[in-house]
Each structure stands twice: as structure tokens, then as C-alpha cells.
Interface confidence: low
């Protein structure tokens, strides 16, 4: 599992190495909402019909990675299933192929910016704006991620359980 | 595995500039960021900053604002980190380190001398 | 910038024993939604940082159970119990809440 994925787990408070059938095939999105209490203060002042507040135009135009991501977890969706606490899990199996890539990569963005903001807990910059990307409104990929991590072998074969670093190694992870 | 392979030893003259580099394998750098850390000789630990490769947003403490620049070529997983008109204060040990700073690579010592 | 202050340059502690290692930041680490972004590393001599606690007390994946991390919004420690030869080093605590982030001076770990 990716490291946006692990670090959403353990945001939900899913501390075990275990992960859950239904995703141990799905991998590029993250799939477990961010609980309420675990949003930083910026974002609950962020409306959240507007998933692109503090984004800069460059990175709300629709990247080749991001579609790639998009389209690997609508094939994730369709064949997998989704996580019952997934913010993606209401309905979605029904209506995701209506819904155009931009609004799904609407809202891909805005659950890596909701995760990159709990992982860090940085504030928007005063100043930010829609134009004026805040340093966390940028995309963290896996921030959750300090967790019990295991997340190095998990990122080097997605499938693969992580085996526990050995305390000794450098990757040592959090 | 996830490795972080940091390129050598660096001896160059005040004034110059290098660019490091940091090679990951294991995991796909787009999904993570990387950030570089200082380390002087005998001394402590400080941030300079982190890119996200993906997009190419970075980040940088203020007193490497104008001398480091942080960037990253996806297709050859690999995160850079690069340095202009070096002095002696710039000799030191960079590390990079993935975005949670749980995997860090062996460290590139950078010598700055005439 | 938040300044993170290690008292204690080094501390020397007999293999077997237990001991704590503090650590300050000059502004409140607890963020309002009850996280607490503080990170403690060791750096064994020769060798890169190994990241030990994340989030103030959650240990890192592979860390013996020996260390822990504790605290308060600006007071912070780092306890390992029943010493080891392999855990001799330098632990520092790091800040991830404001940019830039920062380290504290570092405290090393000696065998008495």
C-alpha cells in the first residue's frame, strides 16, 4: 500500500500492519476519510465545495500523474471496493463513472491537501489566496505517515507486507 | 527495500557551484517528498528544505532561501539538490531523507575549499 | 523561528539503566487538532539519523519497545529503558509544525 494510503490509515486510528483486504489491491488514492478532530484549523475554515481554495493555477491544471492516480482508483473502486469510512465510499460505485476526471481530481487533490495539512499541522500563510498557493497547500503525498510506518517495504512492493525494519537500519522508519 | 543512494564527495573551490544528488529505488519519489538536511562537522542537524516531486513545489528555510535549490527528475527517481557561490560555511555532510524523514540516504560530504 | 533547546549535551548512563532525555521548543508543539508534532532521531557514530518517535509518543516501525516519547505542548522526553550498547549516539528532537523546521543542539548518549 502507498504511503498516502498508510498515512490515511493511521489517521483513521488503523495502527495495525495489517491492512485491509478490500485495499490490498488498491493503490494510488487515498481511500480512508481524515476524521473531523483530525482536520487542521485551516481546513475547517475551508469550504469544502471548494476543493481548490489555495491552490495555484498550476496545480489545478490536470497532470498526467494525477489522471494516472485518477485511473487506477477508479479501476481500485470498481474491482476492490471501497473502505466503508472511505470518503469516496457513498454511492460512489454508482456514480463515479458520471462524474467527469476533473471532479474526481478535484477531489483527490483535496484529500491529499487535507492529509498534507494534518500530517504537518502547518496554518495557510496569511496571505494565501486562490492564486497564491500557501506552502501546504501543496500536495504531501503521504503525510500521515510518520506513522508505525512500515511504509518503506509497502512503497517498494505495494502488495507486499512490510516486514518491520530492523531498529539498526538507516530507512528506520516512522 | 526502500534505499536512498547519495552521490560522492564533493571537494570544490569558494565561489562555485555543485549539485547532489539523491537516487531512490524501492518507491516511486512522486509519492512522497524528499527533504535535505545540513549537517556540519561535529555539529547539529538543520533543515533546508523539501521538494514535492511531483509537481515541483518546494520549500526552504530562510537562510537557504538564496543559496540552495531543491529540485527532482521523476523519471530518473532522483531529487537534486544544488548550491551557488559556495564558501566554507557550506562544508558539511547533506543527507536527503523521504518526506517523513523515516528513510535517509548516506550522506554526501561537501568540502569547500581553496 | 521555533528555537529547540536539548539541555543536556550528553549524558553518560551505564548499560541496563534506564534515562530520559529532554527537550524544549520556545512555542507550543500541540496543534488544535490534538496532534503533537515533535520527532526524536538517533544518529549512531558514522551513521545517518534514524527516525525513533513520531508525533511527540508513537513509535517508529522497527524501534525496540524500550524507547518511548512523552510530554507536554513544549516539554519533551525521550525515555529508553534498559540501555543498550547499539543505542549510544546522538538523539535529537525535531519540530514539524512551523517552517522552517528545526533541531534541537542534539544530546549524545555515553557508556559509562
Known amino acids: 500500500m502507498k504511503r498516502k494510503e498508510r498515512i490515511a490509515r493511521r489517521l483513521e486510528g488503523i495502527e495495525t500492519d495489517t491492512q485491509p483486504i478490500l485495499l490490498q489491491s488498491c493503490t494510488g488514492l487515498v481511500t480512508h476519510r481524515l476524521l473531523e478532530e483530525d482536520t487542521p484549523r485551516y481546513m475547517r475554515a475551508t469550504d469544502p465545495a471548494s476543493p481548490h481554495i489555495g491552490r495555484s493555477n498550476e496545480e489545478e491544471e490536470t497532470s498526467d500523474s494525477s489522471l494516472e492516480k485518477q485511473t487506477r482508483s477508479k479501476q481500485c473502486t470498481e474491482t476492490s471496493g471501497i473502505h466503508a469510512d472511505s470518503p469516496y465510499s457513498s454511492g460512489i460505485m454508482d456514480t463515479q463513472s458520471l462524474e467527469s476526471k476533473a471532479e474526481r481530481i478535484a477531489r483527490y487533490k483535496a484529500e491529499r491537501r487535507r492529509q498534507l495539512a494534518e500530517k504537518y499541522g502547518l496554518t495557510l500563510d496569511p496571505e494565501a489566496d486562490s492564486e497564491t498557493p500557501s506552502r501546504y497547500s501543496r500536495s504531501r503525498k503521504d503525510p500521515e505517515a510518520a506513522e508505525k510506518r512500515g511504509v518503506r517495504s509497502e512503497r517498494s512492493a505495494e502488495s507486499s507486507r512490510d516486514a518491520g525494519s530492523s531498529y539498526s537500519r538507516t530507512e528506520l522508519s516512522g | 527495500e526502500v534505499q536512498l543512494q547519495q552521490s560522492g564527495a564533493e571537494l570544490v573551490r569558494p565561489g562555485a557551484s555543485v549539485k547532489l544528488s539523491c537516487t531512490a529505488s524501492?518507491?516511486?519519489?512522486?509519492?512522497?517528498?524528499m527533504h535535505w538536511v545540513k549537517q556540519r562537522p561535529e555539529q547539529g542537524l538543520e533543515w533546508i528544505g523539501w521538494?514535492?516531486?511531483?509537481?515541483?513545489?518546494?520549500e526552504y528555510a530562510s537562510k537557504f532561501q538564496d543559496k540552495a535549490t531543491i529540485t527532482a527528475d521523476t523519471s530518473s527517481n532522483t531529487a537534486y539538490l544544488q548550491f551557488s557561490s559556495l564558501t566554507s560555511e557550506d562544508t558539511a555532510v547533506y543527507y536527503c531523507?523521504?518526506?517523513?524523514?523515516?528513510?535517509w540516504g548516506q550522506g554526501t560530504t561537501l568540502t569547500v575549499s581553496s | 523561528d521555533i528555537v529547540m533547546t536539548q539541555a543536556a549535551p550528553s549524558i553518560p548512563v551505564t548499560p541496563g539503566q534506564s534515562v530520559s532525555i529532554s527537550c524544549r521548543s520556545s512555542?507550543?508543539?500541540?496543534?488544535?487538532?490534538?496532534?503533537?508534532?515533535l520527532y526524536w532521531f538517533l544518529q549512531r557514530p558514522g551513521q545517518s539519523p534514524q527516525l525513533l518517535i513520531y508525533?511527540?509518543?508513537n513509535l517508529a516501525s522497527g524501534v525496540p519497545d524500550r524507547f518511548s516519547g512523552s510530554g507536554s505542548a513544549t516539554a519533551f522526553t525521550l525515555r529508553i529503558s534498559r540501555v543498550e550498547a547499539e543505542d549510544v549516539g546522538v538523539y535529537y528532537c525535531?519540530?514539524?509544525?512551523?517552517?522552517?523546521?528545526?533541531f534541537g543542539a542534539g544530546t549524545k548518549l555515553e557508556l559509562k
Open positions: 531523507t523521504t518526506g517523513e524523514f523515516d528513510n
Open positions: 524501492g518507491f516511486n519519489i512522486k509519492d512522497d517528498h
Open positions: 521538494i514535492d516531486p511531483e509537481n515541483g513545489d518546494t
Open positions: 512555542k507550543s508543539l500541540l496543534h488544535s487538532n490534538g496532534n503533537t508534532y
Open positions: 508525533r511527540m509518543s
Open positions: 525535531m519540530q514539524h509544525l512551523e517552517y522552517p523546521f528545526s
